[in-house]
Interface confidence: medium
Amino acid sequence: DFGLDCDEHSTESRCCRYPLTVDFEAFGWDWIIAPKRYKANYCSGECEFVFLQKYPHTHLVHQANPRGSAGPCCTPTKMSPINMLYFNGKEQIIYGKIPAMVVDRCGCS
Amino acid sequence: DFGLDCDEHSTESRCCRYPLTVDFEAFGWDWIIAPKRYKANYCSGECEFVFLQKYPHTHLVHQANPRGSAGPCCTPTKMSPINMLYFNGKEQIIYGKIPAMVVDRCGCS
């Protein structure tokens, strides 16, 4: 499993992971106490046939070509959690691990 | 976590799981001994904002709206393996569990 890493200066048009820092304060998400900012990353780019396909399934659907199947898109294929301090629904402040907050790898699926 | 299930008669335009039977013989994939056909399913449909978003990350990227982020697309969010009998690259016949061959759920990511 591998994926491309890019930055704002990259000329890569294919599916790639780009850096993105999310700022909760800028969003007005005041129920999140910490971190106020974190490195989330995101996926962007084109998915030419077979490039960075995570699953054999993606290839099979392309072969079968059913009605309405749009072809693969550039999406997170590996994500990781972060620890956060936040208000839960009961107005308690909780320290907890929130899954799938960081994109570690992008691919076509 | 939930996802929509549709069939060929559905009028649903949103991201949905559709039935798809993959036929390896029809593809000419003769290195797969068994199964010759299996129910793979696929994802198709529109991802309006917040609908069926698997990860909070998807929402955050939408909020941050970085250059080139294309918005979420309808993609498998839960997959399962199948057991297969197949020739490997060394002409050995192997019985093994192949991951991510069946789409169990679709969502927007």
């Epitope: 820092t21 106490i33 971190p35 106020k36 900012r37 301090l85 402040i93 909780i94 320290y95 | -």
Partner: antibody
Framework: QVQLVQSGPGLVKPSETLSLTCTVS??????????WGWIRQPPGKGLEWIGT???????YYNPSLKSRVTISVDTSKNQFSLKLSSVTAADTAVYYC?????????????????WGQGTTVTVSS | DIQLTQSPSSLSASVGDRVTITCRAS??????LGWYQQKPGKAPKRLIY???SLQSGVPSRFSGSGSGTEFSLTLSSLQPEDFATYFC?????????FGQGTKLEIK
């Protein structure tokens, strides 16, 4: 590295307001990974978290003290302060300031490190 | 609030001894617990974070274990500089709360 130096009176009269300041050196109080807190320790007793602030002014207080506590930040002076109103003898304690560190990767957090040197505050007339 | 109960409240031991201090939480706090050492007239110093991770620069004779509601701090071979008071801290639910402390004295 970051160091915290406390200042403020050691004696406060009952019903008055206790005021302490913590000056940060070796780092910016406006660092988005840093949070700034106060803890106290009555004589011969355990530690009690009072509250925590972020440089933007967002504050979180211990409910047991919330009605009497104000924590504020002065980014221009690189310091933050504690005010505790309507004090009684039960507020006699050693007061500490401390930093919390939250890494922006979300993987590593560090509570109460480093600490200030501590200020002994006696409430007495 | 989550209560942390430390035991024993005081302990006498000799240099070279192995000692264990326990901390019991009033509800499940996963592994969101730290251990601190405090010497007279000084600010506390963190020894252990996330229940079992050793703070950088802390000697390996200190170790932490546990999760949920039962935690312990073990000193494998006491050194003269280890005689101090030890506190546990939970950082799972605000307000953060500390144990009442265990005073480790020289026998």
């Amino acid at each position: 590295q970051v160091q915290l130096v406390q200042s403020g009176p050691g004696l406060v009269k009952p019903s008055e307001t206790l005021s302490l300041t913590c000056t940060v050196s070796g780092g910016s109080i406006s660092n988005s990974n840093y949070y700034w807190g106060w803890i106290r320790q009555p004589p011969g007793k355990g530690l009690e978290w009072i509250g925590t602030t972020y440089y933007s002014g967002t504050t979180y207080y211990n409910p047991s003290l919330k009605s009497r506590v104000t924590i504020s930040v002065d980014t221009s002076k690189n310091q933050f302060s504690l005010k505790l109103s309507s004090v009684t003898a039960a507020d006699t304690a050693v007061y500490y300031c401390a930093r919390d560190y939250y890494d922006s990767s979300g993987y590593y957090y560090n509570w109460f490190d480093p600490w200030g040197q501590g200020t002994t505050v006696t409430v007495s007339s | 609030d989550i209560q942390l109960t430390q035991s024993p409240s005081s302990l006498s031991a000799s240099v070279g001894d192995r000692v264990t201090i326990t901390c019991r939480a009033s509800q499940d706090i996963r592994n969101d617990l730290g251990w601190y050492q405090q010497k007279p007239g000084k600010a506390p110093k963190r020894l252990i974070y996330a229940a079992s991770s050793l703070q950088s620069g802390v000697p390996s004779r200190f170790s932490g274990s546990g999760s949920g509601t039962e935690f312990s701090l073990t000193l494998s071979s006491l050194q003269p500089e280890d005689f101090a008071t030890y506190f546990c801290l939970q950082h799972h639910i605000y307000p953060w709360t500390f144990g009442q402390g265990t005073k480790l004295e020289i026998k």
